[in-house]
């Protein structure tokens, strides 16, 4: 049966025994800035082009053992959530991956900046259709990272990022705090904000909307046919990147403002239990869970 | 995220250094009274001191960025400091990434075209 997260974002008309919007997102390219990925995994083979971009810090610790499947874990799962054949949101989207996070999932602001610059230069050299950039990472507030995101957004690129897993105000983190970026928090199958150990999803006015981010089934780098469940605001952001790809594929001329408006318009409203958030943040945090447009848009989204 | 709201720096640390001295006889001295600012991550364990993103003013050309980077290296060398330019930015933001001692920040902030300097910091998979 359909995984809970795909059912949650799917309009009622499509809640059959499977989720298969034909060719969703085929006009859009999604850039993923993350770890290395297992690009020949059965779930994503032929859908992800691994660019030659790599800018990562050395792994911490003298006894660190670099195991390929672990190095690829985070990025492979997210690529699967965005465009995987069986558990992906936008099954028609093609992706390009840039490695900005090392085998421990750690990167730098500077490496991310150089990655964003690489995307801009690629866009200028070979203009394609709409671009979505997925940034499933977070660091402390960074003026320069936010500025780079602003410039890329002004160049017509849609940026989607994780709100952060610190159970804190997303405005204290980047790129989550960049106003031009679509910042995504995580909810679970009960529409509760996701708890992650002692922490959980970030919140506050810098979050644009929430999306499924707990127990998300996706491609596992443990083997070429494996699946695994992962949780986090990265997984939530990957859902929104997939939804954005489908919306842009159906309406390639959408501006960032129009896309943001549509994401909000089609979201489920007031379903999140706000008691989880600190009292002073409840009114500031959007009570929105991302969803695909309803069946009235069938000709646009499911052609 | 969340458009239409003014930026909030939160705990973000900002160190403003006024540009007073005209030392080193800069050919392109900054306009009188302008200040370049220094920023670093508020979360101490995430800081990466020793690597800095020098962001130049918006309309700065690549050649000017390269010249500014070279000037920084020359002035640092005169003070006995080794520096390494790791990357010159152009396309999104003008500027450069430099590996250098934090002792040189005051000097770097006085360079022409400099808008602000940010210490590098870590980002993490979420």
């Amino acid at each position: 049966s359909i995984p809970w997260n795909l059912e949650r974002i799917t309009p009622p008309r499509y809640r059959a025994d499977e989720y298969q919007p034909p060719d969703g997102g085929s006009l859009v390219e999604v850039y993923l800035l993350d770890t290395s990925i297992q690009s020949d995994h059965r779930e994503i083979e032929g859908r992800v082009m691994v660019t030659d971009f790599e800018n990562v810090p050395e792994e911490d610790g003298t006894r660190f053992h670099r195991q390929a499947s672990k190095c690829d874990s985070h990025g492979t799962h997210l690529a699967g959530v965005v465009s995987g054949r069986d558990a992906g949101v936008a099954k028609g989207a093609s992706m390009r991956s840039l490695r900005v996070l090392n085998c421990q999932g750690k990167g730098t602001v500077s490496g991310t900046l150089i990655g964003l610059e690489f995307i801009r230069k690629s866009q200028l050299v070979q203009p394609v259709g709409p671009l979505v950039v997925l940034l499933p990472l977070a660091g402390g507030y960074s003026r320069v990272l936010n500025a780079a995101c602003q410039r890329l957004a002004r160049a017509g690129v849609v940026l989607v990022t994780a709100a952060g897993n610190f159970r804190d105000d997303a405005c204290l983190y980047s790129p989550a705090s960049a106003p031009e970026v679509i910042t995504v928090g995580a909810t679970n199958a009960q529409d509760q904000p996701v708890t992650l150990g002692t922490l959980g999803t970030n919140f506050g006015r810098c979050v644009d909307l929430f999306a499924p981010g707990e127990d998300i089934i996706g491609a596992s780098s443990d083997c070429s046919t494996c699946f695994v469940s992962q949780s986090g605001t990265s997984q939530a952001a990957a859902h929104v990147a997939g939804i954005a790809a489908m919306m842009l594929s159906a309406e390639p001329e959408l501006t960032l403002a129009e896309l943001r408006q549509r994401l909000i318009h089609f979201s489920a409203k007031d379903v999140i239990n706000e008691a989880w958030f600190p009292e002073d943040q409840r009114v500031l945090t959007p009570n929105l869970v991302a969803a695909l447009p309803p069946s009235t848009h069938e000709n646009l989204y499911f052609q | 995220g969340a458009m239409g709201q003014e930026d909030e720096d939160g705990d973000y640390e900002e160190l403003v250094l006024a540009l007073r001295s005209e030392e080193d006889g800069l050919a392109e001295a900054p306009e009188h009274g302008t200040t370049a600012t220094f920023h670093r991550c508020a979360k101490d364990p995430w800081r990466l001191p020793g690597t800095y993103v020098v962001v130049l003013k918006e309309e700065t050309h690549l050649s000017q960025s390269e010249r500014t980077a070279r000037r920084l290296q020359a002035q640092a060398a005169r003070r006995g400091y080794l520096t390494k330019i790791l990357h010159v930015f152009h396309g999104l933001l003008p500027g450069f990434l430099v590996k250098m001692s934090g002792d040189l920040l005051e000097l770097a902030l006085k360079l022409p075209h400099v808008d602000y300097i940010e210490e590098d910091s870590s980002v993490f998979a979420q």
Epitope: E18, S39, D40, R42, E45, G46, D86, S224, T225 | -
Partner: antibody, heavy 115, light 110 residues
């Protein structure tokens, strides 16, 4: 143009081994593994397994476990399938195909096992 | 894993439509969006005709279409032509491997 070019026909005695090669070109190797499929005379297609150009990982069909080895050499863009302890019922045309999706196929290599 | 079940043969006259079924279980055809169909002429390598249930690779005639309901996938060929005479194989993911159908011989009459 995406192409898979296989090595030539082989005649082997029972108990011997055979190694078939498959040279890939025209696409980004690491985006796809290589599947191996065989077809005995007058029979249907049988999936034997898959091998990665990215990291050399393999996924063998249960029936093949222990008797077959699939490898890749990214430096020459070539995948290999070795079958040991050959029996007469291993007589077949062996195909390589691109990825699990098997959207592009090699021309086939006839392996005859006969005493 | 057992082969998927296909009719051994089907036939039709030029211009007609025919459908070939491919029945599996919830662990293969019913559980994945990845059913493919291959055409094979005698002495030739198989050729991909349909992938991911209903998608056609570029260069394949739109007379070929695929669908799926529950544990059964179907290939429909409309406007039958003499060159369509061939063997047709379905294929599906399983949890860890791939499985083919036994094959269907399509004969174009007359």
């Amino acid at each position: 143009e995406v192409q898979l070019v296989q090595s030539g026909a082989e005649v082997k005695k029972p108990g011997a081994s055979v190694k078939v090669s498959c040279k890939a070109s025209g696409y980004t190797l690491t985006s796809y593994g290589i599947s191996w499929v065989r077809q005995a005379p007058g029979q249907g297609l049988e999936w034997m397994g898959w091998v990665s150009f990215y990291n050399g990982n393999t996924n063998y069909a249960q029936k093949l476990q222990g008797r077959g080895t699939m490898t890749t050499d990214p430096s020459t863009s070539t995948a290999y399938m070795e079958l040991r302890s050959l029996r007469s019922d291993d007589t077949a045309v062996y195909y390589c195909a691109r990825g699990y999706g098997m959207d592009v196929w090699g021309q086939g290599t006839t392996v005859t096992v006969s005493s | 894993e057992s082969a998927l079940t296909q009719p051994a043969s089907v036939s039709g006259s030029p211009g007609q439509s025919i459908t070939i079924s491919c029945t599996g279980t919830s662990s293969d055809v019913g559980g994945y969006n990845s059913v493919s169909w291959y055409q094979q002429h005698p002495g030739k390598a198989p050729k991909l005709m349909i992938y991911e249930v209903s998608n056609r690779p570029s260069g394949v005639s739109n007379r070929f279409s695929g669908s799926k309901s529950g544990n059964t996938a179907s290939l429909t060929i409309s406007g039958l032509q003499a060159e369509d005479e061939a063997d047709y194989y379905c294929n599906s993911y399983t949890s860890t491997s791939m499985v083919f159908g036994g094959g269907t011989k399509l004969t174009v009459l007359g």
